[in-house]
Amino acid sequence: EVEKTACPSGKKAREIDESLIFYKKWELEACVDAALLATQMDRVNAIPFTYEQLDVLKHKLDELYPQGYPESVIQHLGYLFLKMSPEDIRKWNVTSLETLKALLEVNKGHEMSPQVATLIDRFVKGRGQLDKDTLDTLTAFYPGYLCSLSPEELSSVPPSSIWAVRPQDLDTCDPRQLDVLYPKARLAFQNMNGSEYFVKIQSFLGGAPTEDLKALSQQNVSMDLATFMKLRTDAVLPLTVAEVQKLLGPHVEGLKAEERHRPVRDWILRQRQDDLDTLGLGLQGGIPNGYLVLDLSMQEALS
């Protein structure tokens, strides 16, 4: 907290300019009018204020706007944004995508901080949904943003926004999140032809049900093993050996390397050994000839 002292004669700031960087903290507090600062915030980021001086500027704005800064100030905060606490940011009403971009730019290249998370939350709540432009912006700065949202929050993503999603944006999503995103992606890409559709839908397939996987197996998609391993176990289990063979195409050989891992392991346990043998991969653990597994839940519990 800076002491309240009178501004020395001739030092009263008429405008926000570079001469102010040589003011002591108390001079800055005494000689810069908060209203002047607020109206000339666009100049602040171009002036190399010292670390301590930024604290003084924040203090002045806090006094002027105890209920929260107006957007005209927020969009020009620059490095001052990094002096804000989540509590400060909760008081803001940010509606402009340009303001959001300006503040995200300040934190660019760093992990999402509590301040940024609060800012995004305020912005998205203000908009009512995650529209395409917002999603474009957020995933450009934070590729993992989508996967940081709860399934409930993801439900507000309109299918049209899915076009903005890149495969790397889904890297850290769990099955519950993909369950929400997959139907939206299916809707978004429904008018694409087979091969183009598969390229787009591939990253979302961790949320696909069995019937969609069966349909894909009829389309010569040649799914890679990395994608197959991310499929829901409950969606893979009902697939026949022939369907998995068609689904994977030339990648079917990769099953051998993954036979001890889910969902491949669990899928093998559900197949007749005879059928598995037709693949010629040496997969073991299928149901022996003449056996009938009745209690499937017990079978899974034992495995």
Epitope: P48, T50, Y51, L54, Y79, L82, K83, V106, N107, G109, H110, E111, M112, S113, P114, Q115, V116
Partner: nanobody, 119 residues
């Protein structure tokens, strides 16, 4: 994190010159502006000069025309060239910067280098 190491200080006669260096290491790509401060005995620390990534500089009025600041971006070194030194320039000179990290700003200082100007 950023490490700053100053050098080049010493004892010099009034009217003489010194060139201080500040070598930065660590997260130097995040640095925008470098600052030279000084602190005379019993006085408050004061800003002497600044230089930003683009090479724009600011120099305190009381040393303008005598002091200049420059940088060697390739070596991550900032210099403070001090000419026509006066006894009142006697102080410990510090290099400083701050960078964004983890959603906040972090302030970094060198250990300081003593400049003594005798009359």
């Amino acid at each position: 994190q950023v490490q700053l190491v100053e050098s080049g200080g010493g004892l010099v006669q009034a009217g003489g010159s010194l060139r201080l260096s500040c070598a930065a290491s660590g997260s130097t790509s995040s640095i925008n502006t470098m600052y030279w401060f000084r602190q005379a005995p019993g006085e408050e620390r004061e800003l002497v000069a600044t230089i930003n990534r683009g090479g724009s500089t600011n120099v305190r009025d009381s040393v303008k025309g005598r002091f200049s600041v420059s940088r060697d971006s390739a070596k991550n070194i900032v210099y403070l060239q001090m000419n026509r030194l006066k006894p009142e320039d006697t102080a410990v000179y510090y290099c400083n910067t701050y960078i964004p990290y983890g959603g906040t700003l972090h302030d970094f200082w060198g250990q300081g280098t003593q400049v003594t100007v005798s009359s």
